[in-house]
Interface confidence: low
């Protein structure tokens, strides 16, 4: 299971679904806190290891996921064509 | 090229549910999130709700119990579920772009000409 | 609740003239804002998404600027075209309650 930290927020304040957060989660062994449906998740260790970043299916529902040059990260694409890209540091 | 129209706008008496319909050309609407947005005359815009492609939804506070938002195949549905006459209005459904959630900017890219719902005795 | 606070109500402006118009928002909304044109008896158009992104076919008179909780559209060198009412939606999601969208009242934009 995963929750959402708020970075540099009041903690009395409702949790924010925002850029400037990151997820604490309790993940079972063999797999490491990921994104999934673009929420934080438990995903395979495996992908991450591998920078297979589309098989954790981190996109929205409806959205097409591509890896970016050299598995840096990925790109999501709506069926409109916008595009929301994801780097991994 | 597209396009989004709404139907179902009629007059209405107080407490007779009225559902209105929200029909795509050009792009197919189960892919989408789509909204529900409406106008009073010579008033602001306001917005009621938003449904997603697995047909979970959420709403504006005022607007919850008011009305459903639900989904076919091919449209998108919004129920006002006892109309009162503050809701006579323009109603307009909008495709979402952006992204919802998570820190991305959600925004309308595309909106239906509207319909007009009056609701009187 | 979100709630986008939009100044002023209403503008009179000369063609070529700069304008703008201002959204505060409640809390930090993280650049979740867009801006719209609606003219009478039309639905409104997106003009600016992500608080600084031009829309395609949107002439680039129209910009956007801003962070945390206080935005501004600006029209630089007003056309009479651009008589319209112009309205901001802010948005935020919450962990707990999903997703809410609020409109700005409305600036009526008139040119002279």
């Known amino acids: 299971t995963c929750e959402i930290v708020t970075l540099d927020r009041d903690s009395s304040q409702p949790r924010r679904t925002i850029a400037r957060q990151t997820a604490r989660c309790a993940c079972r062994k063999g797999q490491i806190a990921g994104t999934t449906r673009a929420r934080p998740a438990c995903v395979d260790a495996r992908i991450i290891k591998t920078k297979q970043w589309c098989d954790m299916l981190p996109c929205l529902e409806g959205e097409g996921c591509d890896l970016l040059i050299n598995r840096s990260g990925w790109t999501c694409t709506q069926p409109g064509g916008r595009i929301k890209t994801t780097t991994v540091s | 090229q597209e396009q989004l129209v709404e139907s179902g706008g009629r007059l209405v008496t107080p407490g007779t549910p009225l559902t209105l319909s929200c029909t795509a050309s050009g792009f197919f609407l189960s892919g989408y999130y789509m909204s529900w947005v409406r106008q009073a005359p010579g008033k602001g815009l306001e917005w009621i709700g938003i449904i997603y492609p697995s047909g979970s939804t959420d709403y504006a506070s005022w607007a919850k119990g008011r009305f459903t938002i639900s989904k076919t195949s091919t449209t998108v549905d919004l129920k006002i579920t006892t109309p009162t006459t503050e809701d006579t209005a323009t109603y307009f459904c909008?495709?979402?772009?952006?992204?919802?959630?998570?820190?991305?900017?959600?925004?309308?890219?595309?909106w239906g000409p509207g319909t007009l719902v009056t609701v009187s005795l | 609740e979100l709630v986008m606070t939009q100044t002023p109500p209403s503008l009179s402006a000369s063609v070529g003239e700069t304008v703008r118009i201002r959204c505060l928002a409640s809390e930090d909304i993280y650049s979740g804002i867009s801006w719209y044109q609606q003219k009478p008896g039309k639905p409104p158009t997106l003009l600016i998404y992500g608080a600084s992104n031009l829309e395609s076919g949107v002439p680039p008179r129209f910009s956007g600027s801003g962070s945390g909780s206080d935005y501004t559209l600006t029209i630089g060198g007003v056309q009479a075209e651009d008589a319209a009412t112009y309205y901001c939606?802010?948005?935020?999601?919450?962990?707990?309650?999903?997703?809410?969208?609020?409109f700005g009242a409305g600036t009526n934009v008139e040119i002279k």
């Open positions: 939606l802010g948005g935020v999601t919450y962990s707990s309650t999903g997703t809410h969208l609020t």
């Open positions: 909008a495709r979402v772009a952006g992204y919802v959630g998570y820190g991305y900017e959600t925004f309308f890219d595309i």
